[in-house]
């Protein structure tokens, strides 16, 4: 999906009002400097691409983020403020339902959410280029 035509300010507002708090709740108990920041993004569409990938694509050691509160709110924000996003996600959602697993917060998931916090932080930068 190409995130170029999203309403970035509306997505930013959704992040600031709710998603950020849900990310913080998920990370509760984690040490501030426990994880290195290794994932980056250069502009807002790129940030959303990385955010979508880390939030919704299962990775080795962390298959369970998509059902977390922050993930569901992220999905809703992208569906509302990115034209055509919902349609591209129908097949992915059906595939995800088939392999849904019990929710387990692993250290790998915490590391992944730490990276997500960094990506959202970059997405919110006021001077970050659209393209």
């Amino acid at each position: 999906y190409d995130f170029t035509n999203c309403d970035f300010e509306k997505i930013k507002a959704a992040y600031l009002s709710t998603i950020s708090k849900d990310l913080i709740t998920y990370m509760s108990g984690t040490k501030s400097t426990e994880f290195n920041n290794t994932v980056s993004c250069s502009n807002r569409p790129h940030c959303l691409t990385e955010i979508q990938s880390l939030t919704f694509n299962p990775t080795a050691g962390c298959a369970s983020l998509a059902k977390e509160m922050f993930a569901m709110k992220t999905k809703a924000a992208l569906a509302i403020w990115c034209p055509g996003y919902s349609e591209t996600q129908i097949n992915a959602t059906q595939a995800m339902k088939k392999r849904r697993k019990r929710k387990v917060t692993t250290n790998k998931c915490l590391e992944q959410v730490s990276q997500l916090q960094g990506l959202w932080r970059r997405f919110n930068r006021p001077l970050l280029k659209q393209q």
Epitope: L16, S20, K21, I24, T25, M27, S28, G29, T30, K31, S32, T33, E34, F35, N36, N37, T38, S40, S114, Q115, Q117, G118, R121, R122, R125
Partner: antibody, heavy 118, light 107 residues
Framework: QVQLVQSGAEVKKPGASVKVSCKAS????????MHWVRQAPGQGLEWMGE????????DYNQNFRGRATMTVDMSTSTVYMELSSLRSEDTAVYYC???????????WGQGTLVTVSS | DIQLTQSPSFLSASVGDRVTITCKAS??????VAWYQQKPGKAPKLLIY???MRHTGVPSRFSGSGSGTEFTLTISSLQPEDFATYFC?????????FGQGTKLEIK
């Protein structure tokens, strides 16, 4: 182990500028954010802003926008905080402090006293 | 910005006493609150993060609790080295803010 070593005390006249340094060691310099916090004599702590050493992006407390400038020297793993148009109310101890993506401060510099006096 | 109000501002107590310091936030900060101890001429030291988690090396007599808008720091049995100033801080939302401090003095 993580160490943040700050420059020495400064005395400045009103209207002047001061540049405080914070040299970091014991960790991957670009992996974490560096913040500046100040404390006026006998007062509380005030967050001034932060810099991301990986790309020098800064975010400031609105109270300091336009007067504070944070920069980074990658070659020496040093962060700088410059405060311009100094006034007597800027007399304070200035601390650098380190965080990851969660913004509480588990590592602090020793502090730099800046005195603004005519 | 989120305001943090600490109470009391000053507290006199004796060695062995149990003391409680309160920090109230002007809006919900989940559990994103830290507590620091500061002694004269020194940088603040992290005691508690995530409202209730003790930082490495912090004695078990220090404990934190609370969520939402009300938080407390408790020292179960004061030791001579605990007389200092204590600050709370919220990191739930930008800009990061501190309470005004509580100075704990020997009675």
């Amino acid at each position: 182990q993580v160490q943040l070593v700050q420059s020495g005390a400064e005395v400045k006249k009103p209207g002047a500028s001061v540049k405080v340094s914070c040299k970091a060691s014991g960790y991957t310099f670009t992996s974490y954010l560096m913040h500046w916090v100040r404390q006026a004599p006998g007062q509380g702590l005030e967050w001034m802003g932060e810099i991301d050493p990986s790309d020098s992006y800064t975010d400031y407390n609105q109270n300091f926008r336009g007067r504070a400038t944070m920069t980074v020297d990658m070659s020496t793993s040093t962060v700088y905080m410059e405060l311009s148009s100094l006034r007597s109310e800027d007399t304070a101890v200035y601390y650098c402090a380190l965080t990851g993506t969660i913004n509480y401060f588990d590592y602090w510099g020793q502090g730099t006293l800046v005195t603004v006096s005519s | 910005d989120i305001q943090l109000t600490q109470s009391p501002s000053f507290l006199s107590a004796s060695v062995g006493d149990r003391v409680t310091i309160t920090c109230k936030a002007s809006q919900d900060v989940v559990t994103a609150v830290a507590w620091y101890q500061q002694k004269p001429g020194k940088a603040p030291k992290l005691l508690i993060y995530w409202a209730s988690m003790r930082h490495t090396g912090v004695p078990s007599r220090f404990s934190g609790s609370g969520s939402g808008t009300e938080f407390t720091l408790t020292i179960s049995s004061l030791q001579p080295e605990d007389f200092a100033t204590y600050f709370c801080q919220q990191y739930s939302s930008f800009t990061f803010t501190f309470g005004q401090g509580t100075k704990l003095e020997i009675k």
